[in-house]
């Protein structure tokens, strides 16, 4: 025999004090599949957590974090607090990237700055604490005579021509 | 050990003010965020104030905004909550709570560790 539960799509629950008819999930509770004998509470949004998307009777409430604030864990169990660019939260708190390191987000670790070197290139921008080198040809490409790319022309002032 | 033990509950008539606190000792309290959570008698846990590590974010239930205010001396190891225009609804056993990880704040199902409580009575 079938069960009849299992006729009940999500966003109802299978009613064992009505005869095991489908009812619709009460406020503030969804089943997300069929045939289930209860719905689910939906989760609430409140304080550093807010709503990024509202409960449905067939799906729970999703949240996010307040600005100054960033998810952690899964379904963002968790908000974080942000640090500034260039710097990196640690046991005591949010801290400066040390010396040839650097961090362009409000969240997650510093990391050294790219080794030019290894790839046989040369700096072309200097690193900071929020942001990475710029590698630039390799030191060979910037030999006098093996430049590709052509001189600008000489600026002329107005009113003389060539000689 | 984590220890946190709340102090300042009492009777007081509805409009009057009460301040509780909180004091924290076994963990650097300055590296975690703080909260308050009652029960009122035969209901369930109710999340009341939220606290950053730094004492510079707040966060409160909709029901409470405006009368309480949640605060944090880091140098003293002591959560406060000041309670103004206090409401028979707001008779409750209040706790204290620590969040589980530094500079983050948490769900209530994930606090690690509780106070023991303190009870406010708001009645005539």
């Known amino acids: 025999l079938q069960d009849p539960c299992s006729n009940c799509p999500a966003g109802t629950f299978c009613d064992n004090n009505r005869n095991q008819i489908c009812s619709p999930c009460p406020p503030n509770s969804f089943s997300s599949a069929g045939g289930q004998r209860t719905c689910d509470i939906c989760r609430q949004c409140k304080g550093v957590f807010r709503t990024r998307k509202e409960c449905s009777s067939t799906s729970n409430a999703e949240c996010d974090c307040t600005p100054g604030f960033h998810c952690l864990g899964a379904g963002c169990s968790m908000c974080e607090q942000d640090c500034k660019q260039g710097q990196e939260l640690t046991k005591k708190g949010c801290k400066d990237c040390c010396f040839g390191t650097f961090n362009d987000q409000k969240r997650g670790i510093c990391r050294p700055w790219t080794n030019c070197s290894l790839d046989g290139k040369s700096v072309l921008v200097n690193g900071t604490k929020e942001r990475d080198v710029v590698c630039g040809p390799s030191p060979a490409d910037l030999s006098p005579g093996a430049s590709s790319v052509t001189p600008p022309a000489p600026a002329r002032e107005p009113g003389h021509s060539p000689q | 050990q984590v220890q946190l033990v709340e102090s300042g509950g009492g009777l007081v008539q509805p409009g009057g003010s009460l301040r509780l606190s909180c004091s924290a000792s076994g963990f650097t309290f300055s590296s975690y965020a703080m909260s308050w959570v009652r029960q009122a008698p035969g209901k369930g846990l109710e999340w009341v104030s939220d606290?950053?590590?730094?004492?510079?974010?707040?966060f409160y239930e909709d029901s409470v905004k405006g009368r309480f205010t949640i605060s944090r001396d880091n140098a003293k190891n002591t959560l406060y909550l000041q309670m103004n225009s206090l409401r028979a609804e707001d008779t409750a056993v209040y706790y204290c709570?620590?969040?589980?990880?530094?500079?983050?704040?948490?769900?209530?199902?994930?606090?690690?560790?509780w106070g023991q409580g303190t009870l406010v009575t708001v009645s005539f």
């Open positions: 606290i950053n590590s730094g004492g510079e974010s707040t």
């Open positions: 709570a620590k969040h589980p990880l530094t500079y983050t704040i948490a769900t209530m199902n994930d606090y690690d560790y």
